[in-house]
Interface confidence: low
């Protein structure tokens, strides 16, 4: 399919690099529209003038940050994963909510609760959720700390989810935990408020169980008090989900090729 | 680029399936020899008569078991990973070794030590190691148990490595932990005996720290005693490494294409 | 997915994983691999229609795009997606060796 | 690896990742994607010589095999190995949306 062009790649059929680039560009035009399930570019008639809203930019930047830290392995991509995922975020319930009252006294843990009605507004059906990440902004940390994440399970029990070894650091850094399964469960259940606990890792021998790491949104040194929340940077859930209307479209065309 | 041909694959140059199969078979001939860095099939003149030795078959079966449980994702394959890896195994040091004496009394942990001279015999240089797995045969388990694996670090301290949530089960099952980094460290250091600890996960609240799971090789109910070892099925390290002579060959041809 | 479950049970004409069992003795004339006697190597075959060009009605191709050219390649190609390793036993002189060969078995394919 | 570090700094003629920056406005004529303005899509290009046939001297090809036809394909093909997603911001009516598109950026290639 190829023809020679100056000093370009030598191939058994020498390659026209420009043609390949052009074909790739045209394929990307199709790929983007197809991933968004758009038959043509959306009309820009109603787009409000001026820059993008702050919150949208913050969300876009959160998503970009995730990408930057992501391993670049190609995963096999089921059909549902091929299509674009809408990204939303749900901030942690503010700490003056009564749910926090019974968890005030611990030095080894901090607690983060989320309003499931906000989650359901963002993701109306559990099956639509393709990824949920709990994002925490950790402030500087003087010593290495091993932390564990738990999910609130029943009345007063907690289920272990995952752990992380945090290296000492002079600068703030976002931590991200994959909590897709947990959020999917929450969306399936009737509860109003659900939560996580971040704890120091307690080994069976050691008795030094203090959570040393400072998470933005919880006043340093008074973790038991759970005071001032620093705006947009308090813990949040970053959600990636197939929009409902796109999912319905997918369902109706579930035939193969 | 494709054109139809009865019920065969539709292609523009209709596909001769037999030709493609033949080409794939020839390519596999090259692939296998190339992965083993053999210029031609090895001579069979000195092969001893009779079946394969028991130990070799056990090792082959261990490797096959690993494959069966392995996720079938293609990983990006650096040059060193393209070539075949020799598989060996090193059994845990028998429990009458004095190293175990100081770890007798714990109900929340079992200990597994390995002779580094045996490891070095199998893998002469740390860089040759491409994977090390700690394999444990867990016997039936009545209740769910959350276990943690630690590495012996300094005199009496242990470094957390990973954890596993074990579901109840009526039949024995191999557990596998990736300990490549740890074994690479051991190969780099001068120690004679190195070890792991498998412990119950201890949360900061809960005080029920008993290790419920039975690991083959440790007498049930008397974990503190660490008595009879059941032959080949006691814990072992499964090692995958580039043979030294193949590695030297690789080093000398480290130019690109 | 274009995997063995789907492809081996269908008459899919486009990109799919195809069955291929290799018997070391019969197909390669080799007696030196002692275990296994052969293996299911499989292979990928079938067209990946480009299906996106400026004269195609956008709406018609959307549903097909993700299978035929999900990577938006200039010339999509039917290639392995999921691969598995193969352990073998052979002798070097009198010494038996167990070696693992990476990425030998094709489990599924994709247009890339 | 045939990644951006190696390929962008070499004159590799065989399979490699090639630079391609797409400016949504200039290259696609699109003004509807508000962020980003464009992205490094890149693409895979270059031959994967077959390099194994019965009349080839075995020993000569061993060193090359793992790059030219590591998957032992009947017709090896230069395709993406590592891919990354792309988040975008666009409007549907008056409502801004942030969406993530999977597998949009080619970071490295392989012969498969």
């Amino acid at each position: 399919d190829y023809k020679d062009d100056d000093d370009k790649l030598s191939t058994s059929k020498t390659i026209d690099m420009e043609l390949v680039k052009r074909k790739r560009i045209e394929a990307i035009r199709g790929q983007i529209l197809s991933k968004l399930r758009l038959a043509s570019p959306p009309s820009q008639g109603e787009v409000p003038p001026g820059p993008l809203p702050e919150a949208v930019l913050a969300l876009y930047n959160s998503t970009r940050d995730r990408v930057a830290g992501e391993s670049a392995e190609p995963e096999p991509e089921p059909e549902a994963d091929y299509y674009a995922k809408e990204v939303t975020r749900v901030l942690m319930v503010e700490t003056h909510n009564e749910i926090y009252d019974k968890f005030k006294q611990s030095t080894h843990s901090i607690y983060m609760f989320f309003n499931t009605s906000e989650l359901r507004e963002a993701v109306p059906e559990p099956v639509l959720l393709s990824r949920a990440e709990l994002r925490l902004l950790r402030l500087k940390l003087k010593v290495e700390q091993h932390v564990e994440l738990y999910q609130k399970y029943s009345n007063n029990s907690w289920r272990y989810l995952s752990n992380r070894l945090l290296a000492p650091s002079d600068s703030p850094e976002w931590l991200s935990f994959d909590v897709t399964g947990v959020v999917r469960q929450w969306l399936s259940r009737g509860g109003e408020i659900e939560g996580f606990r971040l704890s120091a890792h307690c080994s069976c021998d050691s008795r030094d169980n203090t959570l040393q790491v400072d998470i933005n949104g919880f006043t340093t040194g008074r973790r038991g008090d759970l005071a001032t929340i620093h705006g947009m940077n308090r813990p949040f859930l970053l959600l990636m989900a197939t929009p409902l209307e796109r999912a319905q479209h997918l369902q109706s065309s579930r035939h193969r090729r | 680029d494709y054109k139809d041909d009865d019920d065969k694959l539709s292609t523009s140059k209709t596909i001769d399936m037999e030709l493609v199969k033949r080409k794939r078979i020839e390519a596999i001939r090259g692939q296998i020899l190339s992965k083993l860095r053999l210029a031609s099939p090895p001579s069979q003149g000195e092969v001893p008569p009779g079946p394969l030795p028991e130990a070799v078959l056990a090792l082959y079966n261990s490797t096959r078991d690993r494959v069966a449980g392995e996720s079938a994702e293609p990983e990006p394959e650096p040059e060193a990973d393209y070539y075949a890896k020799e598989v060996t195994r090193v059994l845990m040091v028998e429990t009458h070794n004095e190293i175990y004496d100081k770890f007798k009394q714990s109900t929340h942990s079992i200990y597994m030590f390995f002779n580094t001279s045996e490891l070095r015999e199998a893998v002469p240089e740390p860089v040759l190691l491409s994977r090390a797995e700690l394999r444990l045969l867990r016997l039936k388990l009545k209740v769910e148990q959350h276990v943690e694996l630690y590495q012996k670090y300094s005199n009496n301290s242990w470094r957390y490595l990973s954890n596993r949530l074990l579901a109840p089960s009526d039949s024995p099952e191999w557990l596998s932990f990736d300990v490549t980094g740890v074994v690479r460290q051991w190969l780099s250091r001068g120690g004679e005996i190195e070890g792991f600890r498998l412990s119950a996960h201890c949360s900061c609240d809960s005080r029920d720290n008993t290790l419920q799971v039975d690991i083959n090789g440790f007498t049930t109910g008397r974990r503190g005693d660490l008595a009879t070892i059941h032959g080949m099925n006691r814990p072992f390290l499964l090692l995958m490494a580039t043979p030294l002579e193949r590695a030297q060959h690789l080093q000398s041809s480290r130019h690109r294409r | 997915a274009l995997d063995t479950n789907y492809c081996f049970s269908s008459t899919e004409k486009n990109c799919c994983v195809r069955q291929l069992y290799i018997d070391f003795r019969k197909d390669l004339g080799w007696k030196w691999i002692h275990e296994p006697k052969g293996y299911h190597a499989n292979f990928c075959l079938g067209p990946c229609p480009y299906i996106w060009s400026l004269d195609t009605q956008y709406s018609k191709v959307l549903a097909l795009y993700n299978q035929h050219n999900p990577g938006a390649s200039a010339a999509p190609c039917c290639v392995p997606q999921a691969l598995e390793p193969l352990p073998i036993v052979y002798y070097v002189g009198r010494k038996p060796k167990v070696e693992q060969l990476s990425n030998m078995i094709v489990r599924s394919c994709k247009c890339s | 690896a045939l990644d951006t570090n190696y390929c962008f700094s070499s004159t590799e003629k065989n399979c490699c990742v090639r630079q391609l920056y797409i400016d949504f406005r200039k290259d696609l004529g699109w003004k509807w994607i508000h962020e980003p303005k464009g992205y490094h899509a890149n693409f895979c290009l270059g031959p994967c010589p077959y390099i194994w046939s019965l009349d080839t001297q075995y020993s000569k090809v061993l060193a090359l095999y793992n790059q030219h036809n590591p998957g032992a394909s009947a017709a090896p093909c230069c395709v993406p190995q590592a891919l990354e997603p792309l988040p975008i911001v666009y409007y549907v009516g008056r409502k801004p949306k942030v969406e993530q598109l999977s597998n949009m950026i080619v970071r490295s290639c392989k012969c498969s």
Epitope: E18, L19, K21, R22, E26, P41 | - | S53, L54, D55, T56 | Y21, D23, K26, D27, L28, G29, W30, K31
Partner: antibody, heavy 122, light 108 residues
Amino acid sequence: QVQLVESGGGVVQPGRSLRLSCAASGFTFSSEAMNWIRQPPGKGLEWIGYIYTSGTTYRANWARGRFTISRDNSKNTLYLQMNSLRAEDTAVYYCARGTHIYDHYYWVHHLWGQGTLVTVSS
Amino acid sequence: DIQMTQSPSSLSASVGDRVTITCQASQSISTYLAWYQQKPGQPPKLLIYAASTLESGVPSRFSGSGSGTDFTLTISSLQPEDFATYYCQSYSDGDSVGFGQGTKVEIK
């Protein structure tokens, strides 16, 4: 004002080379894809090729061996290098800028220069 | 490469006439077609793109139609300034940028 001015034309012998220039003004040249088109005397228009902002060029099949398109954004100038010229290359050579309309960006020629005449003759 | 065939190659008409010029592509180009007007000694001027979209500033007596392979340029009521040569151009991608041979519209 917005304009394109071609220069560098003239009489040249067969087999020789010539470089045409196109000076752009009144718009942000570095942001535009640019085209070369020619018109032999008394005949129709022939598209030669275009260059995007990044410097990547696309050319008509017939132009690939002998014609090279380049640009110098710092000088707001587009170039056409023509080698091994033949009598049939005699034409008025135009540079043109693409339009800004969605999906019709590169090759719909919205703004044209006045052209420069190249005569290949011995 | 795509070939563009215009017909007729020339035509004579009077002021006020309705004039139709056709253009045929050797393969489908969707609606990726433009029409240009060229007067002697001047560069071409864009009239229509996307087969039927009028370029701004072009009088509404000019219209275009068609898709796929067959296209038409119509001048509903010919004016004195419309006597010129008209070219169609395909542009579905860089491989298929091509002009028709032109149609000369002369005064009858």
